[in-house]
Protein backbone atom coordinates (compact mmCIF):
# COMPACT_ATOMS: atom_id res chain seq x y z
CA UNK A 1 0.00 0.00 0.00
CA UNK A 2 2.78 2.44 0.94
CA UNK A 3 4.53 1.93 -2.40
CA UNK A 4 1.25 2.35 -4.28
CA UNK A 5 0.52 5.54 -2.34
CA UNK A 6 3.96 6.97 -3.07
CA UNK A 7 3.63 6.27 -6.81
CA UNK A 8 0.19 7.88 -6.97
CA UNK A 9 0.62 10.77 -4.55
CA UNK A 10 2.78 13.58 -5.92
CA UNK A 11 3.17 14.92 -2.37
CA UNK A 12 4.61 11.80 -0.78
CA UNK A 13 8.24 12.92 -0.94
CA UNK A 14 7.99 16.42 0.56
CA UNK A 15 10.28 16.18 3.60
CA UNK A 16 9.40 16.79 7.25
CA UNK A 17 9.37 20.50 7.98
CA UNK A 18 7.58 21.21 4.70
CA UNK A 19 4.14 20.79 3.19
CA UNK A 20 2.90 20.04 -0.29
CA UNK A 21 1.55 23.39 -1.41
CA UNK A 22 -1.63 23.02 -3.46
CA UNK A 23 -1.59 26.76 -4.14
CA UNK A 24 1.74 26.36 -5.94
CA UNK A 25 1.16 23.29 -8.12
CA UNK A 26 2.10 20.87 -5.31
CA UNK A 27 5.71 21.91 -4.87
CA UNK A 28 7.16 21.57 -1.36
CA UNK A 29 7.08 24.73 0.74
CA UNK A 30 8.59 25.25 4.20
CA UNK A 31 6.24 25.29 7.15
CA UNK A 32 5.37 28.90 8.04
CA UNK A 33 6.59 30.33 11.37
CA UNK A 34 4.95 28.75 14.44
CA UNK A 35 3.99 25.59 12.58
CA UNK A 36 5.59 22.19 11.95
CA UNK A 37 5.30 18.89 10.09
CA UNK A 38 6.92 15.95 11.83
CA UNK A 39 6.52 13.54 8.88
CA UNK A 40 7.04 13.81 5.14
CA UNK A 41 4.27 14.02 2.58
CA UNK A 42 2.09 16.41 4.56
CA UNK A 43 -0.40 18.68 2.81
CA UNK A 44 -0.52 21.11 5.74
CA UNK A 45 1.66 22.05 8.68
CA UNK A 46 0.30 21.84 12.22
CA UNK A 47 0.18 24.88 14.47
CA UNK A 48 2.79 24.76 17.23
CA UNK A 49 1.56 24.25 20.75
CA UNK A 50 1.96 27.38 22.88
CA UNK A 51 2.92 26.97 26.53
CA UNK A 52 1.08 29.80 28.27
CA UNK A 53 -0.13 30.63 31.76
CA UNK A 54 0.58 27.78 34.15
CA UNK A 55 2.39 25.91 31.34
CA UNK A 56 6.02 26.68 30.53
CA UNK A 57 8.10 25.68 27.51
CA UNK A 58 10.24 22.59 28.00
CA UNK A 59 11.20 22.32 24.30
CA UNK A 60 10.73 24.98 21.64
CA UNK A 61 8.74 24.23 18.49
CA UNK A 62 10.83 23.56 15.38
CA UNK A 63 9.80 23.10 11.75
CA UNK A 64 9.80 19.31 12.33
CA UNK A 65 8.55 18.92 15.93
CA UNK A 66 5.95 20.43 18.20
CA UNK A 67 6.74 22.40 21.33
CA UNK A 68 6.66 20.49 24.61
CA UNK A 69 5.31 22.01 27.81
CA UNK A 70 5.70 21.29 31.48
CA UNK A 71 4.23 23.10 34.48
CA UNK A 72 5.43 26.10 36.44
CA UNK A 73 6.72 25.45 39.99
CA UNK A 74 3.91 24.51 42.36
CA UNK A 75 2.12 22.51 39.66
CA UNK A 76 2.64 19.11 38.04
CA UNK A 77 1.68 17.57 34.67
CA UNK A 78 -1.36 15.40 34.09
CA UNK A 79 -2.47 13.64 30.92
CA UNK A 80 -0.67 12.64 27.76
CA UNK A 81 1.95 15.18 26.74
CA UNK A 82 1.24 17.27 29.84
CA UNK A 83 -2.20 18.33 28.63
CA UNK A 84 -3.11 19.70 32.09
CA UNK A 85 -1.31 21.21 35.07
CA UNK A 86 -2.57 20.37 38.54
CA UNK A 87 -1.67 22.20 41.73
CA UNK A 88 0.89 20.55 44.01
CA UNK A 89 0.02 19.91 47.65
CA UNK A 90 2.40 19.19 50.52
CA UNK A 91 3.23 15.66 51.55
CA UNK A 92 0.51 14.54 53.93
CA UNK A 93 -2.18 16.26 51.86
CA UNK A 94 -4.40 15.60 48.85
CA UNK A 95 -6.01 17.94 46.35
CA UNK A 96 -9.79 18.32 46.67
CA UNK A 97 -12.27 20.63 45.00
CA UNK A 98 -11.72 22.99 47.91
CA UNK A 99 -7.92 22.90 47.65
CA UNK A 100 -5.26 20.98 49.55
CA UNK A 101 -6.56 19.08 52.61
CA UNK A 102 -4.65 17.06 55.20
CA UNK A 103 -4.90 13.31 54.95
CA UNK A 104 -7.51 11.82 57.31
CA UNK A 105 -6.23 9.71 60.20
CA UNK A 106 -5.25 6.27 58.93
CA UNK A 107 -4.20 7.54 55.51
CA UNK A 108 -1.01 9.02 54.10
CA UNK A 109 0.47 10.64 50.98
CA UNK A 110 4.25 10.73 50.57
CA UNK A 111 4.10 12.81 47.34
CA UNK A 112 3.07 16.31 46.30
CA UNK A 113 0.43 14.85 43.99
CA UNK A 114 -2.16 12.10 44.14
CA UNK A 115 -4.55 11.04 46.85
CA UNK A 116 -4.18 9.92 50.44
CA UNK A 117 -3.98 6.11 50.71
CA UNK A 118 -4.77 3.91 53.71
CA UNK A 119 -1.93 2.76 55.91
CA UNK A 120 -0.89 -0.84 55.35
CA UNK A 121 -2.80 -3.26 57.60
CA UNK A 122 0.11 -5.23 59.04
CA UNK A 123 -2.17 -7.78 60.71
CA UNK A 124 -3.44 -9.00 57.32
CA UNK A 125 0.05 -10.42 56.78
CA UNK A 126 0.22 -11.66 60.34
CA UNK A 127 2.72 -8.94 61.21
CA UNK A 128 2.87 -6.22 63.83
CA UNK A 129 3.35 -2.46 63.47
CA UNK A 130 7.00 -1.64 63.95
CA UNK A 131 6.76 2.10 63.17
CA UNK A 132 3.49 4.00 63.34
CA UNK A 133 2.14 5.71 60.24
CA UNK A 134 1.81 9.47 59.83
CA UNK A 135 0.05 11.69 57.29
CA UNK A 136 3.26 11.60 55.24
CA UNK A 137 4.45 8.03 55.76
CA UNK A 138 3.00 4.54 55.73
CA UNK A 139 3.37 2.28 58.74
CA UNK A 140 6.36 -0.02 58.84
CA UNK A 141 5.41 -3.63 59.51
CA UNK A 142 7.69 -5.76 61.66
CA UNK A 143 7.93 -9.46 62.36
CA UNK A 144 4.79 -11.30 63.45
CA UNK A 145 4.15 -11.46 67.22
CA UNK A 146 4.81 -15.22 67.13
CA UNK A 147 8.30 -14.57 65.79
CA UNK A 148 9.04 -12.47 68.88
CA UNK A 149 7.67 -14.93 71.52
CA UNK A 150 10.17 -16.50 73.99
CA UNK A 151 11.74 -19.73 72.78
CA UNK A 152 11.25 -18.90 69.14
CA UNK A 153 14.25 -20.16 67.24
CA UNK A 154 15.82 -18.79 64.12
CA UNK A 155 17.24 -22.19 63.24
CA UNK A 156 16.21 -23.32 59.78
CA UNK A 157 13.79 -26.26 60.00
CA UNK A 158 15.13 -29.59 58.71
CA UNK A 159 14.45 -30.52 55.13
CA UNK A 160 11.46 -32.86 54.69
CA UNK A 161 12.35 -36.57 54.57
CA UNK A 162 12.19 -38.30 51.20
CA UNK A 163 9.35 -40.67 50.56
CA UNK A 164 10.29 -44.36 50.99
CA UNK A 165 11.29 -46.11 47.84
CA UNK A 166 12.85 -43.06 46.22
CA UNK A 167 16.60 -43.11 45.72
CA UNK A 168 18.62 -39.86 45.67
CA UNK A 169 18.85 -38.19 42.24
Amino acid sequence: FERTRSLQDPCSNCPAGTFCDNNRNQICSPCPPNSFSSAGGQRTCDICRQCKGVFRTRKECSSTSNAECDCTPGFHCLGAGCSMCEQDCKQGQELTKKGCKDCCFGTFNDQKRGICRPWTNCSLDGKSVLVNGTKERDVVCGPSPADLSPGASSVTPPAPAREPGHSPQ
Epitope: D9, P10, C14
Partner: nanobody, 121 residues
Framework: EVQLLESGGGEVQPGGSLRLSCAAS????????MGWYRQAPGKRREFVAA???????VYAESVKGRFTISRDNAKNTVYLQMSSLRAEDTAVYYC???????????????WGQGTLVTVKP
Protein backbone atom coordinates in the same frame (compact mmCIF):
# COMPACT_ATOMS: atom_id res chain seq x y z
CA GLU B 1 6.63 34.04 -8.46
CA VAL B 2 8.51 30.90 -9.58
CA GLN B 3 11.16 31.59 -12.21
CA LEU B 4 13.46 29.09 -13.98
CA LEU B 5 16.10 30.46 -16.34
CA GLU B 6 18.15 28.04 -18.45
CA SER B 7 21.50 28.89 -20.02
CA GLY B 8 24.52 27.14 -21.55
CA GLY B 9 23.00 25.86 -24.79
CA GLY B 10 24.75 26.18 -28.11
CA GLU B 11 26.21 24.35 -31.07
CA VAL B 12 28.69 21.52 -30.49
CA GLN B 13 30.30 18.75 -32.55
CA PRO B 14 29.48 15.06 -31.99
CA GLY B 15 31.50 13.72 -29.06
CA GLY B 16 31.69 17.18 -27.53
CA SER B 17 30.48 18.47 -24.15
CA LEU B 18 28.22 21.22 -22.80
CA ARG B 19 27.04 22.25 -19.36
CA LEU B 20 23.53 23.59 -18.97
CA SER B 21 22.51 25.69 -15.98
CA CYS B 22 19.09 26.49 -14.56
CA ALA B 23 18.89 29.40 -12.12
CA ALA B 24 15.80 29.15 -9.90
CA SER B 25 13.98 31.76 -7.82
CA UNK B 26 10.63 32.39 -6.15
CA UNK B 27 10.46 29.18 -4.12
CA UNK B 28 12.44 27.12 -1.59
CA UNK B 29 14.94 25.54 -3.95
CA UNK B 30 16.73 23.25 -1.49
CA UNK B 31 13.65 21.21 -0.55
CA UNK B 32 12.39 20.57 -4.07
CA UNK B 33 13.32 18.16 -6.84
CA MET B 34 14.46 19.57 -10.18
CA GLY B 35 14.52 17.94 -13.59
CA TRP B 36 15.74 18.35 -17.14
CA TYR B 37 13.56 17.52 -20.14
CA ARG B 38 14.12 17.93 -23.86
CA GLN B 39 12.08 18.31 -27.01
CA ALA B 40 13.56 17.50 -30.41
CA PRO B 41 12.00 19.06 -33.52
CA GLY B 42 8.72 17.31 -34.38
CA LYS B 43 8.84 15.11 -31.28
CA ARG B 44 7.21 15.07 -27.85
CA ARG B 45 8.97 16.48 -24.81
CA GLU B 46 10.84 13.71 -22.97
CA PHE B 47 12.41 13.20 -19.55
CA VAL B 48 16.22 13.44 -19.36
CA ALA B 49 17.26 13.51 -15.68
CA ALA B 50 16.07 14.57 -12.23
CA UNK B 51 17.57 15.25 -8.83
CA UNK B 52 15.68 15.44 -5.54
CA UNK B 53 16.46 17.59 -2.51
CA UNK B 54 18.39 14.70 -0.93
CA UNK B 55 20.47 14.49 -4.17
CA UNK B 56 19.09 11.14 -5.35
CA UNK B 57 19.22 11.12 -9.14
CA VAL B 58 17.33 9.41 -11.97
CA TYR B 59 18.29 9.31 -15.65
CA ALA B 60 16.65 8.34 -18.91
CA GLU B 61 18.24 5.21 -20.39
CA SER B 62 19.32 7.14 -23.48
CA VAL B 63 21.62 9.47 -21.49
CA LYS B 64 22.89 7.20 -18.69
CA GLY B 65 26.68 7.34 -18.40
CA ARG B 66 26.90 10.42 -20.62
CA PHE B 67 24.89 13.09 -18.75
CA THR B 68 25.19 14.09 -15.10
CA ILE B 69 22.66 16.15 -13.17
CA SER B 70 23.80 18.09 -10.09
CA ARG B 71 22.66 20.98 -7.92
CA ASP B 72 24.11 23.80 -5.87
CA ASN B 73 21.61 24.75 -3.18
CA ALA B 74 23.66 27.78 -2.16
CA LYS B 75 23.31 29.18 -5.70
CA ASN B 76 19.75 27.91 -6.29
CA THR B 77 21.01 26.33 -9.49
CA VAL B 78 20.70 22.91 -11.12
CA TYR B 79 23.16 21.73 -13.77
CA LEU B 80 23.21 19.20 -16.60
CA GLN B 81 26.72 18.16 -17.64
CA MET B 82 26.45 16.60 -21.10
CA SER B 83 29.34 14.69 -22.70
CA SER B 84 29.80 12.30 -25.64
CA LEU B 85 27.07 14.26 -27.37
CA ARG B 86 25.33 12.73 -30.40
CA ALA B 87 23.22 14.17 -33.21
CA GLU B 88 20.11 12.67 -31.60
CA ASP B 89 20.73 14.82 -28.47
CA THR B 90 19.81 17.91 -30.52
CA ALA B 91 16.78 19.48 -28.81
CA VAL B 92 15.50 22.36 -26.75
CA TYR B 93 16.37 21.51 -23.14
CA TYR B 94 13.92 22.58 -20.44
CA CYS B 95 14.43 22.88 -16.72
CA UNK B 96 11.48 21.75 -14.59
CA UNK B 97 10.50 22.23 -10.98
CA UNK B 98 8.99 18.88 -9.98
CA UNK B 99 5.89 18.37 -7.86
CA UNK B 100 6.35 17.08 -4.33
CA UNK B 101 10.15 16.57 -4.50
CA UNK B 102 9.55 13.41 -6.55
CA UNK B 103 12.01 11.97 -9.07
CA UNK B 104 10.14 8.66 -9.49
CA UNK B 105 7.29 9.10 -11.99
CA UNK B 106 7.91 12.87 -11.81
CA UNK B 107 5.43 15.49 -12.89
CA UNK B 108 6.40 19.08 -13.55
CA UNK B 109 4.87 21.98 -11.62
CA UNK B 110 6.74 24.80 -13.43
CA TRP B 111 8.79 24.98 -16.64
CA GLY B 112 11.62 27.20 -17.80
CA GLN B 113 11.73 28.75 -21.26
CA GLY B 114 14.32 26.29 -22.62
CA THR B 115 17.77 26.48 -24.17
CA LEU B 116 18.67 25.04 -27.59
CA VAL B 117 21.41 22.42 -27.94
CA THR B 118 22.51 21.56 -31.47
CA VAL B 119 24.90 18.69 -32.18
CA LYS B 120 26.22 18.70 -35.76
CA PRO B 121 29.51 17.93 -37.53
Amino acid sequence: EVQLLESGGGEVQPGGSLRLSCAASGFSFSINAMGWYRQAPGKRREFVAAIESGRNTVYAESVKGRFTISRDNAKNTVYLQMSSLRAEDTAVYYCGLLKGNRVVSPSVAYWGQGTLVTVKP
